[in-house]
């Protein structure tokens, strides 16, 4: 990895030992100011492999709501408008990065925690296993 | 929101103003290991919208590597194999939190950041705009 | 939540003409075909009439020239005007989007008697 000189005018950790516990300021820095303002919100509709979404509420994650994407099809869209099954429609899935309440129902404790979402889905031309 | 009892366990917030500090165990716990074990890591390729993945690293931010998806066309791959501008590749789009080193440097104090990532691509039909 | 009603069924005489509508909610019907199809007690499910997405129709041998399929995309609705209606038309009627791995709705009862 890359070694980092260390700020001499970093803050002293409370805790030299693993698990790691660090500060973390919760005052979120939006980096997205500048993304293409294109939203992706109607993709879920406009896709050859459209999904639903579903919300995922825990009040000790945070973020408390995440959004969870289902395929609504098991097939793709075909140019005719029907559900074809020579094609797939599946989830994109990514690992994130979330904040659990620990000890739980704690406001200022949190441990890292990574989860697997659904983002949305894709069209894919199936694997065909071939029987002897 | 939902209001939760406070813990009398609760480790004391040596902040108690906004910008808001709080402690976080950064041993990880990973809650996928229940997850389909299918792995989404060739959708990439055998999508109608297929993408390219590319390392974006960053040693400033926790984690140091995330992976952005860029659409490999700007249409879609049809059942010939030939891409089809009559259909758009997109890519979907995930706000996710990450860890920012502040003050620089720092092994110890973060900041909440959201960034916007690429995932992965999809299929989707254009919008079009009938001039009068 | 994805869901499609239809609306406009009942009792008629022959000869008589209604027009069903099905409007769709929880998604958007532009990027599928809309089909109607019909089901009468002891028979199968039939296709009646059947829109593509680019607009193309299709019916079925006994309902052409008799019935009209449309739809109307800012709407999210899908239409099925039946004129000439005779008993043998008696079914319960049912909007689909996507065909048959697609979305369907619960149905609207089509009474042809005198």
């Known amino acids: 990895g890359i070694t980092i000189p260390r700020n001499p005018g970093c803050p002293n950790s409370e805790d030299k030992n693993f698990p790691r516990t660090v500060m973390v300021n919760l005052n979120i820095h939006n980096r997205n100011t500048n993304t293409n303002p294109k939203r992706s919100s109607d993709y879920y509709n406009r896709s050859t492999s459209p999904w639903n979404l579903h919300r995922n509420e825990d009040p000790e994650r945070y973020p408390s709501v995440i959004w969870e994407a289902k395929c609504r099809h098991l097939g793709c869209i075909n140019a005719d408008g029907n559900v074809d099954y020579h094609m797939n429609s599946v989830p994109i899935q990514q690992e994130i990065l979330v904040l659990r309440r620990e000890p739980p129902h704690c406001p200022n404790s949190f441990r890292l925690e990574k989860i697997l979402v659904s983002v949305g889905c894709t069209c894919v031309t199936p694997i065909v296993h071939h029987v002897a | 929101g939902i209001t939760i009892p406070r813990n009398p366990g609760c480790p004391n917030s040596e902040d108690k103003n906004f910008p808001r500090t709080v402690m976080v165990n950064l041993n990880i716990h990973n809650r996928n290991t229940n997850t389909n074990p299918k792995r989404s890591s060739d959708y990439y390729n055998r999508s109608t919208s297929p993408w390219n993945l590319h390392r974006n690293e960053d040693p400033e931010r926790y984690p140091s590597v995330i992976w952005e998806a860029k659409c490999r066309h700007l249409g879609c791959i049809n059942a010939d194999g030939n891409v089809d501008y009559h259909m758009n590749s997109v890519p979907i789009q995930q706000e996710i939190l990450v860890l920012r080193r502040e003050p620089p440097h720092c092994p110890n104090s973060f900041r909440l950041e959201k960034i916007l990532v690429s995932v992965g691509c999809t299929c989707v039909t254009p919008i079009v705009h009938h001039v009068a | 939540e994805v869901q499609l009603v239809e609306s406009g069924g009942g009792l008629v005489q022959p000869g008589g003409s209604l027009r069903l509508s099905c409007a769709a909610s929880?998604?958007?019907?532009?990027?599928?075909?809309m089909n109607w199809y019909r089901q009468a007690p002891g028979n199968e499910r039939e296709l009646v009439a059947r829109?593509?997405?680019?607009?193309?129709?299709n019916y079925g041998d006994s309902v052409k020239d008799r019935f009209t399929i449309s739809r109307d995309n800012a709407k999210n609705t899908a239409y099925l005007q039946m004129n000439s209606l005779k008993p043998e038309d008696t079914a319960v009627y049912y909007c689909?989007?996507?065909?048959?791995?697609?979305?369907w709705g619960q149905g609207t009862q089509v009474t042809v008697s005198s």
């Open positions: 829109i593509t997405r680019g607009g193309t129709t």
């Open positions: 689909n989007a996507g065909a048959d791995g697609g979305i």
């Open positions: 929880g998604f958007i019907i532009s990027i599928y075909s």
